[in-house]
Amino acid sequence: HTAAQDNCTCPTNKMTVCSPDGPGGRCQCRALGSGMAVDCSTLTSKCLLLKARMSAPKNARTLVRPSEHALVDNDGLYDPDCDPEGRFKARQCNQTSVCWCVNSVGVRRTDKGDLSLRCDELVRTHHILIDLRHRPTAGAFNHSDLDAELRRLFRERYRLHPKFVAAVHYEQPTIQIELRQNTSQKAAGDVDIGDAAYYFERDIKGESLFQGRGGLDLRVRGEPLQVERTLIYYLDEIPPKFSMKRLT
């Protein structure tokens, strides 16, 4: 995998160490924390990004409560186990031998257990709902302009094909972006919706993962779109398995 050739950096992931030790002296970048080689032409997987984040100084964050079958990430601040492809392993455990099962975006989908807990497969998150509230503007944004701009953003910045942006809903000041992607729909080179959503979330929080690129500057027909709050809901192909105790 190569990176920006001239200065040997990774445009899509600043949490990397790059050096010209690839084949033929080409630039190669490895993710912090895991040391895994990453492809700098596309998004790095969320699992490797979380691992890199945990190897760097970290800030405490508040949690958001999930509702119904939709899971809300508690900002995912744990040191995950990733497979050789950089995906989350279905079972995650902490240093005190507490284990739980996660979905493909690394969000816990079962009660916590011990080392005997079994997670048979990594359950795919096939539907992500990004719920945004924008700051007050002179007037409402034009819905079709907003839709087009967000599709363009997800393609150009996050490399997500517009086919995976299922819908953009807008009722001022709330914008909802629906991402849908079944395993079978992904073709060679297609970005995962979970990775795109994570990069977007970090951009919205002013914590861009891109190297040397400016922060997110979202404009709809020249009018700045400034986000006040974000909630991301994750829907899995198989509903999560939590005990009734957790739901009360």
Epitope: R155, K163, S184
Partner: antibody, heavy 119, light 108 residues
Framework: QVQLVQSGAEVKKPGASVKVSCKAS????????MHWVRQAPGQGLEWMGE????????SYNQKFKGRVTITRDTSTSTAYMELSSLRSEDTAVYYC????????????WGQGTLVTVSS | DIQMTQSPSSLSASVGDRVTITCRAS??????LNWYQQKPGKAPKLLIY???RLESGVPSRFSGSGSGTDFTLTISSLQPEDFATYFC??????????FGQGTKLEIK
Amino acid sequence: QVQLVQSGAEVKKPGASVKVSCKASGYTFTSYWMHWVRQAPGQGLEWMGEITPSDGYTSYNQKFKGRVTITRDTSTSTAYMELSSLRSEDTAVYYCARGHGNYVSFDYWGQGTLVTVSS
Amino acid sequence: DIQMTQSPSSLSASVGDRVTITCRASQDISNYLNWYQQKPGKAPKLLIYYTSRLESGVPSRFSGSGSGTDFTLTISSLQPEDFATYFCQQGYTLPPYTFGQGTKLEIK
């Protein structure tokens, strides 16, 4: 080895339709995007549209204003491109090409199908 | 749509020469630029993708560089089989994906 084999040359009258086929082999048909590109005699390349064989999703070059339809048959690993309301300027070689989702590079191409539109 | 402009449109060179073809995009396309070679009566062949990555089986005398709007294809030492037409193509934004008009490389 990866191969894309297209149907033979066609001669059509203005106003008619043409349907070109592209049979894929040597790889998993549903795992790659398939694109259609045309080239008028002595001219450059023009992207027409794309399909994901897994679910049949398509997107098209708006230049063709609804005249182009791309379909696929996963049972035979074949993609099709139909162009309707043909005019003389549609005379071209039509290519199918396998595409990559991120780079949108076309790494394997069919041999091309010459479509001649003439009255 | 993003316009891709190649220069020169044609070029005469000799075997052993170093040749450079440029491609300019009408807006920033990051590094999502691909190069193809086409010989008469044949389908195009992918040479380079993502600005500088050599497609498998392509000789190392071909190289690509650039970023943003300006890109270059270089052939370090022309071989007889390199005389052909070369096209650049962007895959950055929403469809349609667009090609340059082509550069015809001829024997001097």
